[in-house]
Interface confidence: low
């Protein structure tokens, strides 16, 4: 057993261009809070999959109001550590998700509104009992700086918190087969305490609280002899006494699922189906309450102050499920018209409209050329909800304000080289091609394919295009 601890140092704009706007304003003051989700191993799981190692929610940070005109600074953070207790061994490799949430404190109908500002994820190796590990993660233009560690709760010690230490009974030595507990040399490694009731003759354990059966015995406490009459599930070596195949050790032997959980084998390991009120890899975490942070994605937990009472997750907009673990894809309804891009901001839907359209759902078609002037003799052309200028020769850009580089469009075909000229461009054709844009191949016999070269110009000479 032990605790994973996360310390957030700063959350603010990352270095470089494109600093994000402050998430809070004078009209909408807000405050931040964080959620951490831990999973064992290095699996790249979906954000919504269960936090099998545990989850925690921070307190709310101080209320923050943006100073008008100021760039987003590092935002004020909640006090204290985020702590995720774990009951089993620390797995050594783990995946994490850290979410930064904004709670808007304006006049919201039905209470405060939450929206996800940033989500970072990673996979790390970490030994319990080690020093704080520092990390920087980026999500969009935001940057999160944090430290984390895993520490064992006494009497557990070791990199996985599986060794137990007890004070020495004699000053000079530990008991037979037991080593001193480094770095606590005045304590001794304690023998493993198996699951209560585990048969001392037919069961053993490699981790505290488990009960694994010797061959020929089964049941949660290894007290049930394996039936040799039917021999229906041959998986192991032949028994010399019965001539029958005794099942060899399988992942569900000894039932690794605690608290009445049922075990089913998977191709690689096992899976526990836990009764209500228990969760975790082996159903070892009991009495889920709001203190365990069971609501994902910023869901608000209500009730469940004691292990016997249920909790209810009130999900923020955009999420559903008993633990707010499922994301609602509200953009699948295609609410934005005229090709607008749908953005689900969690607390609201937004439509980013194509040029020439406006309105909350991009429903208004604008007069594309109204009030639009094309410079330097260009003319405005409407069409497809977008305004564009047809520019006079020598000018380009959206409003014909830029002097055009006539060679930018690579007008010379077949590898011809383009030269900008005050009155247009000139193409110097590669051998074997001719024409104003080097578009015509020269036949091997010297005759050109449409049209003939003007007098005085040999194939390969620069061709002026006006």
């Amino acid at each position: 057993a032990g605790v994973f601890e996360l310390q957030i140092h700063s959350f603010g704009p990352g270095p470089g261009p494109g600093a994000p706007r402050s998430p809070c304003s004078a009209r909408l003051p807000c405050r931040l809070f964080f959620r951490v989700c831990l999973k064992p191993g290095l699996s790249e799981e979906a954000a919504e999959s269960p936090c099998a190692l545990g989850a925690a929610l921070s307190a709310r940070g101080p209320v923050y109001t943006e100073q008008p005109g100021a760039p987003a600074p590092d935002l004020p953070l909640p006090d204290g550590l985020l702590q995720v207790p774990f009951r089993d061994a620390w797995p050594g490799t783990f995946s994490f998700i850290i979410e930064t949430w904004r709670e808007e404190l304006g006049d919201q109908i039905g209470g405060p509104a939450w929206s996800l500002l940033a989500r970072v994820a990673g996979r790390r190796r970490l030994a319990a009992g080690g020093p704080w590990a520092r990390d920087i993660q980026r999500a969009g233009a935001w940057e999160l700086r944090f430290s984390y560690r895993a520490r064992c709760e006494p009497p557990a010690v070791g990199t996985a918190c599986t060794r137990l230490c007890r004070p020495r009974s004699a000053p000079s030595r530990c008991g037979p087969g037991l080593r001193p507990c480094a770095p606590l040399e005045d304590e001794c490694e304690a023998p493993l305490v198996c699951r209560a009731g585990c048969s001392p003759e037919h069961g053993f354990c490699e981790q505290p609280g488990e009960c694994r059966c010797l061959e020929g015995w089964t049941g949660p406490l290894c007290t049930v002899p394996v039936s040799t009459s039917s021999c229906l599930s041959p998986r192991g070596p032949s028994s010399a006494t019965t001539g029958c195949l005794v099942p060899g050790p399988g992942p569900c032997d000894g039932n690794p699922c605690a608290n009445g959980g049922s075990c089913s084998e998977t191709p690689r390991s096992f899976e526990c189906t836990c009764p209500r009120g228990f969760y975790g890899l082996r159903c070892e975490v009991s009495g889920v309450t709001c203190a365990d942070g069971p609501c994902f994605n910023g869901g608000l937990c209500v009730g469940g102050a004691d292990p016997d009472s249920a909790y209810i997750c009130h999900c923020p907009p955009g999420f559903q499920g008993s633990n707010c673990e499922k994301r609602v894809d509200r953009c699948s309804l295609q609410p934005c018209r005229n090709g607008g891009l749908c953005l689900d901001l969690g607390h609201a839907l937004r439509c980013r409209c194509r040029a020439g359209f406006a309105g909350p759902r991009c429903e208004h078609d604008l007069d594309d050329c109204a009030g639009r002037a094309c410079a330097n003799g260009g003319t405005c052309v409407e069409g497809g909800g977008a305004h564009r200028c047809s520019c006079a020769l020598g000018f380009g850009g959206r409003d014909c304000r830029e002097r055009a580089d006539p060679c930018a469009a690579r007008p010379c075909a077949h590898g011809g080289r383009c030269y900008a000229h005050f009155s247009g461009l000139v193409c110097a054709c590669a051998p074997g091609y001719m024409g104003a844009r080097c578009e015509f191949p020269v036949h091997p016999d010297g005759a050109s394919a449409l049209p003939a070269a003007p007098p005085g110009l040999r194939p390969g000479d620069p061709q002026r295009y006006l």
Partner: nanobody, 124 residues
Framework: QVQLVESGGGSVQAGGSLRLSCTAS????????MGWFRKAPGKEREGVAD???????SYADSVKGRFTISKDNAKNTLYLQMNSLKPEDTAMYYC??????????????????WGQGTQVTVSS
């Protein structure tokens, strides 16, 4: 530390194909952004394509529809499949890793590990 070794470069006619590989070794368990970059003589280094730990990809406009970036996590290898090659694709191609990348974004200015590069030459 992460070591990156590129391979698969060479000379090819315009319109041909090449597949570049980048094998990572060392401290590779972290969640990475990985990218391909290229540098032609006398030109700035430019990003070609990148891929985030969640598998999402992005491409430079000049290679969209012709190049495909992918990775094989089991082999710790990044790939760049280059089809319909053009003479202007001639460059030294480098693969790079951003150890901090997450949340679906890669930052071309912050890649902290680079390979030695592999030369791609496309002739017309």
């Amino acid at each position: 530390q992460v070591q990156l070794v590129e391979s698969g470069g060479g000379s090819v006619q315009a319109g041909g194909s090449l597949r570049l590989s980048c094998t990572a070794s060392g401290d590779t368990y972290r969640s990475y952004c990985m990218g391909w970059f290229r540098k032609a003589p006398g030109k700035e280094r430019e990003g070609v394509a990148d891929i985030v730990s969640d598998g999402s990809t992005s491409y430079a406009d000049s290679v969209k529809g012709r190049f495909t970036i992918s990775k094989d996590n089991a082999k710790n290898t990044l790939y760049l499949q280059m089809n319909s090659l053009k003479p202007e694709d001639t460059a030294m191609y480098y693969c790079a890793v951003d150890r901090g990348g997450s949340g679906g974004y890669c930052y071309t200015g912050r890649y902290d590990y680079w390979g030695q590069g592999t030369q791609v030459t496309v002739s017309s």
